[in-house]
Interface confidence: low
Amino acid sequence: AQNITARIGEPLVLKCKGAPKKPPQRLEWKLNTGRTEAWKVLSPQGGGPWDSVARVLPNGSLFLPAVGIQDEGIFRCQAMNRNGKETKSNYRVRVYQIPGKPEIVDSASELTAGVPNKVGTCVSEGSYPAGTLSWHLDGKPLVPNEKGVSVKEQTRRHPETGLFTLQSELMVTPARGGDPRPTFSCSFSPGLPRHRALRTAPIQPRVWEPVPLEEVQLVVEPEGGAVAPGGTVTLTCEVPAQPSPQIHWMKDGVPLPLPPSPVLILPEIGPQDQGTYSCVATHSSHGPQESRAVSISIIEPGEEGPTAGSVGGSGLGTLALA
């Protein structure tokens, strides 16, 4: 059988080889498609509801005014010429529809190195047969399940048109120290051969390198945080990170309304200054980090101060400052 591909919605003419160019003709078309149960026979006389789907032209060819998915199948013509010689034509018809240009939706504008990130979802609508979606990085194909690449695919079929919608969600784990501005694109490859791939516009998310979290140290002077009334306590927040982050101060879990500073001086200590203090370092490229908490207390004359201030965990981990 001769393979024929026809675009959905367009006309198709199949020639009946060996048929006389004009009537009277002795020919018969047999169809086995999605519209028929087993074989359907069409003759030049035609007539009836089938004329809107397929009819025999005066020259013996079969004419389909608008090919649909149901027209996929086998078409056979048997013709006898004026000398009584019989000729058979045999066609296998497959239909296709090229979708609109695929698009990347929900695309990320920024990715974080070293952790899985959703890059975006590639969507192709209106294809037949379904075809496939594939992702590219800097023009080279990305292989799922390799080097931190994973792809989630979904195929849906329109209940009325029978056309396919494909979705492909790309997740990647960018390497630390890699390309800060990778180029991703997605392409649709048709299910039928000889049709070129359709490619999306590229996206170029920025890859950010997270700054490694380093311990925030809180140093209290005098050591232990116990001081006589009217004394001075100096709290110093030490962060190894560069450039220096913003330092805010907390007392009893509440932000103190002070400008950012790595040093907090409590002069002329009074009862109102007693409590649990901690500092919060906010670096430009990651969330806030809180230090351990230290307890500041007043020693009444004659009292022995603790050798070390009571120290508690922050209990907050990360927090959003008011």
Epitope: A108, S109, E110, P180, R181, Q204, R206, W208, S284, S285
Partner: antibody, heavy 119, light 108 residues
């Protein structure tokens, strides 16, 4: 037509605060990294702050770290620069600029807003 | 920090001249260099990015070259409207950016 319009500049005393705004129009603001760049009275250009397109990441030079905060509101197409503990050396013309080109040159600049820190 | 040095603060030129403005980086920045033009009373305008790529709408008399540490902006046929300040900028360490001090083109 791409437009970046800065506002909020003025005269402020040392130690004071000021908030600059930059209203963007004519381009996909939420896809662009945005920066503040200042030009000193001696005409030198100095980078002040950068914020990523989604607003998750910010970066500053040591000279303003801890005193200046860059932020953005993508719904309002607006970029901000909160400046506190201002010093005389912060006196400059402040420009907002966008970076869309993949290599991160600054392709669009506003007309600038003047900040003078003086007692 | 990467320092960008424009050794010539001023350059005297005439209409029709070929002018070369140089910029030196304190360390290798690859081709992550941009050039900007600033006319009096105006904001800077991007001319060249990635060391040699001309930005949209920039006349082809402007050419950028160089890589590593040495970069040049060349104006092949100087016009009076090209009288301006020219700044180089590196973004190899993006988002940490640095500019050169600028070179002012003046008429002889």
């Amino acid at each position: 037509e791409v437009k970046l319009v800065e506002s909020g500049g003025g005269l402020v005393k040392p130690g004071g605060s000021l908030k600059l705004s930059c209203a963007a129009s004519g381009f996909a603001f939420s896809s662009y990294d945005m920066s503040w760049v200042r030009q000193t009275p001696e005409k030198r250009l100095e980078w002040v702050a950068t914020i990523s397109s989604g607003g998750s990441y910010t970066s500053y030079p040591d000279s303003v770290q801890g005193r200046f905060t860059i932020s953005r509101d993508n719904a309002r197409n607006t970029l901000y620069l909160q400046m506190s503990s201002l010093r005389s050396e912060d006196t400059a013309l402040y420009y907002c600029a966008s970076s869309q080109l993949p290599p991160y040159a600054m392709d669009y600049w506003g007309q600038g807003t003047s900040v003078t820190v003086s007692s | 920090d990467i320092v960008m040095t424009q050794s010539q603060k001023f350059m005297s030129t005439s209409v029709g001249d070929r002018v070369s403005i140089t910029c030196k980086a304190s360390q290798n920045v690859g081709t992550a260099v941009a050039w900007y033009q600033q006319k009096p009373g105006q904001s800077p305008k991007l001319l060249i990015y990635s060391a040699s790529n001309r930005y949209t709408g920039v006349p082809d008399r402007f050419t950028g070259s160089g890589s590593g540490t040495d970069f040049t902006l060349t104006i092949s046929n100087m016009q009076s409207e090209d009288l301006a300040d020219y700044f180089c900028q590196q973004y190899s360490s993006y988002p940490l950016l640095t500019f050169g001090a600028g070179t002012k083109l003046e008429l002889k």
